[in-house]
């Protein structure tokens, strides 16, 4: 028997100097395009080679983003939110939650999937 | 992982078209960037066009604009470009490219770095 596959949601603030290139990273997600079943929310799809965010490296794909500069990104056209963060200055601080698979059950069984992807 | 299939290429006198297909695996397509590249003997890959998640975006290279068009079906999970009045130095190996989700970042339409994900190219030859 397999044992169950949990999630451990954490919260953090990380503070991103906009590189020569930007922030270095992509989103998916808004209430137009709904990446995750029943939410809206903007998440990090692909964090780029050598940018502001790998750099950092806190950010990670998977990341759920709350908040950009402290404005909620709840209820957001995806073009909406790609905007927000191309206009959101030089330095910028984002509030995301983290979510990190763990296993509880029997030892040497892995659950499979990610309800995210 | 995400495969993508080019099909359509072949050869044809100049002034003619051409319809390319990239068919792409997985469930989240609608959420891709998509684009075209192509690559000429003895060249560097070039960029051709690119179209956003849901069509409302495109953008062209200048030597094409006016001749190819870029679309795609979320449906159907395609990527197509159409290509009319093609010239000879039109000819080229082309290649679909998909980055997932959309850059926060001013675009940088021409860098192949941009995209994750490629097709093994179709080739075009205008005579």
């Known amino acids: 028997m397999n044992g169950r596959v949990d999630y451990l949601v954490t919260e953090e603030e990380i503070n991103l100097t906009r590189g020569p290139s930007g922030l270095g990273f992509n989103i998916v997600g808004g209430t137009d395009q709904q990446y995750v079943s029943n939410d809206s929310g903007i998440y990090v799809s692909r964090i780029k080679e050598n940018g502001a965010a790998a750099l950092d490296g806190r950010l990670q794909e998977g990341d759920k983003i709350l908040s950009v500069n402290g404005q909620d990104l709840k209820n957001l056209l995806h073009q909406d939110a790609v905007d927000l963060f191309r206009n959101a200055g030089y330095a910028v601080s984002l509030r995301v939650q983290h979510r990190l698979q763990v296993q509880n059950g029997p030892i040497g069984h892995r659950g499979e999937g990610d309800p995210s992807g | 992982q995400v495969q993508l299939v080019e099909s359509g290429g072949g050869l044809v006198q100049t002034g003619g078209s051409l319809r390319l297909s990239c068919a792409a695996s997985g469930r989240t397509f609608s959420t891709y960037t998509m684009a075209w590249f192509r690559q000429a003997p003895g060249k560097e890959r070039e960029f051709v066009a690119d179209i956003n998640w849901n069509g409302g975006s495109t953008y062209y290279a200048d030597s094409v604009k006016g001749r190819f068009t870029i679309s795609r079906d979320n449906a159907k999970n395609t990527v197509y470009l159409q290509m009319n009045s093609l010239k000879p130095e039109d000819t080229a190996v082309y290649y679909c490219?998909?980055?997932?989700?959309?850059?926060?970042?001013?675009?940088?339409?021409?860098?192949?770095?941009?995209?994750?994900?490629w097709g093994q190219g179709t080739q075009v030859t205008v005579s």
């Open positions: 490219a998909a980055a997932i989700g959309s850059t926060v970042d001013s675009y940088y339409h021409s860098d192949p770095l941009e995209y994750d994900y």
